[in-house]
């Protein structure tokens, strides 16, 4: 803490300007008023103050504003906002996305900080839900931000944010996280034609379950094989031969270098061999002609 | 036949909560999207949300937004809504509406239970 | 928020055609379904996706949807049919149904 000392004669400043960075921290601790501060903070990102004096003017803040500061001001903290601890920024409400965007611009190129969580943590919740501005700001700034959350947490994306989710939003999602987007994006792109809607969904497919797979083979999609391979495995089992044929399109072909791998191994060790050989593929691993496929589904749907 | 058997008339004090349940009974092992409609005494249909088959994923009209809670139990084959801070206004027939038919962007409300009807009243 | 409007009501002679129209911005860029709901009951749907019908629904219920327009066509109209019809689409995050349309069977 920096002792409270008078301001020497001459020397109190009568704005925000350059020549406070040759003051001493204790000569800006006496000599700058913190409303004053509040008012011009816009001015202080185009100072150069050291990490020890911006320590001052943040302390400053902290005594004027004791129970949080007003967006007023934390629109403006610029690389000040890198001084706060969660704790502080939970003090704030932030409503504004332009503060938002404003604040996450200081950190731009890091990693998501503490600081950084908080602070959007707050925003949303402050919003009641992610809305699509808001999730385009997000995404923007940290690609990988819609898998940090909790299905809980997903469960409040309304469906129009669905929109302005990229596909590389979801590469770090897990099945969890995608069993709850997908629902969500088939809701959001229910106004769209078949060709244009598999386009918009295809991202979201880790989350279909096998009654949509289905559906989708009967619309001549051709899905990628990077798409099949990253279907709910059990959404994929039940799937006969002509439904992943009809699903794949051109791209059945892609099966033979996956047949090692979830989901192709597993599916391949539930269809008959007689089936698998009408592809033509070479596959092999499939259920021997003439013994009886017992239908275990219904049991493992009530267990 | 496919069957949805929703839960008796309520009747509830202002500021109270309200918990409606809704049975599928018929073809009870696959579940389905399930929509919640209301319809005031004499007005017309107002949608309240949305849950998913598995239960995970839940959509609410923003009207309803931190009122209204969407659950699913699917071992007995039920959906619960439940509605909170209840005002006279929120005085109609609650319905449950079932997504039955298959199409990849299709979500019509194809069978419907019969009907709560919830009396908020002091 | 979205809106869709309807007449409230449309009278029209056994035997006749009765056409049912929904209007709303744009809403031919959306996919509208209709429902029919009669006297104390839970309403029924016969349109879904602009004009296909479930199974179960009677031919002379047709749908058709372009511009600002959504409109249900009853053809052959029969008593039973005497009900409240209400529109119904997606718009941003919410399914919105419209005002609704008493038909009356002269």
């Known amino acids: 803490e920096v002792e409270k000392t008078a301001c020497p004669s001459g020397k109190k400043a009568r704005e925000i300007d350059e020549s406070l960075i040759f003051y001493k921290k204790w000569e800006l601790e006496a000599c700058v008023d913190a409303a004053l501060l509040a008012t011009q903070m816009d001015r202080v990102n185009a100072i150069p103050f050291t990490y020890e004096q911006l320590d001052v003017l943040k302390h400053k803040l902290d005594e004027l504003y004791p129970q949080g500061y007003p967006e007023s001001v934390i629109q403006h903290l610029g690389y000040l906002f890198l001084k706060m601890s969660p704790e502080d920024i939970r003090k704030w409400n932030v409503t504004s996305l332009e503060t938002l965007k404003a604040l996450l611009e200081v950190n731009k190129g890091h990693e998501m900080s503490p600081q950084v969580a908080t602070l959007i943590d707050r925003f949303v919740k402050g919003r009641g839900q992610l809305d699509k501005d808001t999730l385009d700001t997000l995404t923007a700034f940290y690609p990988g931000y819609l898998c940090s959350l909790s299905p809980e947490e997903l469960s409040s994306v309304p469906p129009s944010s669905i929109w302005a989710v990229r596909p590389q939003d979801l590469d770090t999602c897990d099945p969890r996280q995608l069993d709850v987007l997908y629902p969500k994006a088939r809701l959001a792109f229910q106004n769209m034609n078949g060709s244009e809607y598999f386009v918009k969904i295809q991202s979201f497919l880790g989350g279909a379950p096998t009654e949509d797979l289905k559906a989708l083979s009967q619309q001549n999609v051709s899905m990628d094989l990077a798409t099949f391979m990253k279907l709910r495995t059990d959404a994929v089992l039940p799937l006969t031969v002509a439904e992943v044929q009809k699903l794949l399109g051109p791209h059945v072909e892609g099966l033979k270098a996956e047949e090692r791998h979830r989901p192709v191994r597993d599916w391949i060790l539930r269809q008959r061999q007689d089936d698998l050989d009408t592809l033509g593929l070479g596959l092999q691993g499939g259920i021997p002609n003439g013994y009886l496929v017992l239908d275990l589904s219904m049991q493992e749907a009530l267990s | 036949e496919v069957q949805l058997v929703q839960s008796g008339a309520e009747v509830k004090k202002p500021g109270a909560s309200v918990k409606v349940s809704c049975k599928a009974s018929g073809d009870t092992f696959k579940r389905y999207y399930m929509h919640w409609v209301r319809q005031a005494p004499g007005q017309g249909l107002e949608w309240m949300g949305i849950i998913n088959p598995s239960g995970v994923s839940t959509t609410y009209a923003q009207k309803f937004q931190g009122r209204v809670t969407m659950t699913r139990d699917t071992s007995t084959s039920t959906v619960y809504m439940e509605l909170s801070s209840l005002r006279s206004e929120d005085t109609a027939v609650y319905y449950c509406?079932?997504?039955?038919?298959?199409?990849?962007?299709?979500?019509?409300?194809?069978?419907w239970g019969q009907g709560t009807l919830v009396t908020v009243s002091s | 928020s979205y809106e869709l409007t309807q007449p409230p009501s449309v009278s029209v002679s056994p035997g006749q055609t009765a056409s049912i129209t929904c209007s709303g911005d744009k809403l031919g860029d959306k996919y509208a379904s209709w429902y029919q709901q009669k006297p104390g009951q839970s309403p029924v749907l016969v349109i879904y996706q602009d004009n296909r019908r479930p199974s179960g629904i009677p031919e002379r219920f047709s749908g058709s949807n372009s511009g600002n327009t959504a409109t249900l066509t009853i053809s052959g109209t029969q008593a039973m049919d005497e009900a409240d019809y209400y529109c119904q689409v997606w718009d941003s995050d919410t399914y919105v149904f419209g005002t609704g349309t008493k038909v009356t069977v002269l």
């Open positions: 509406a079932e997504v039955r038919g298959s199409g990849f962007n299709y979500f019509g409300m194809d069978v």
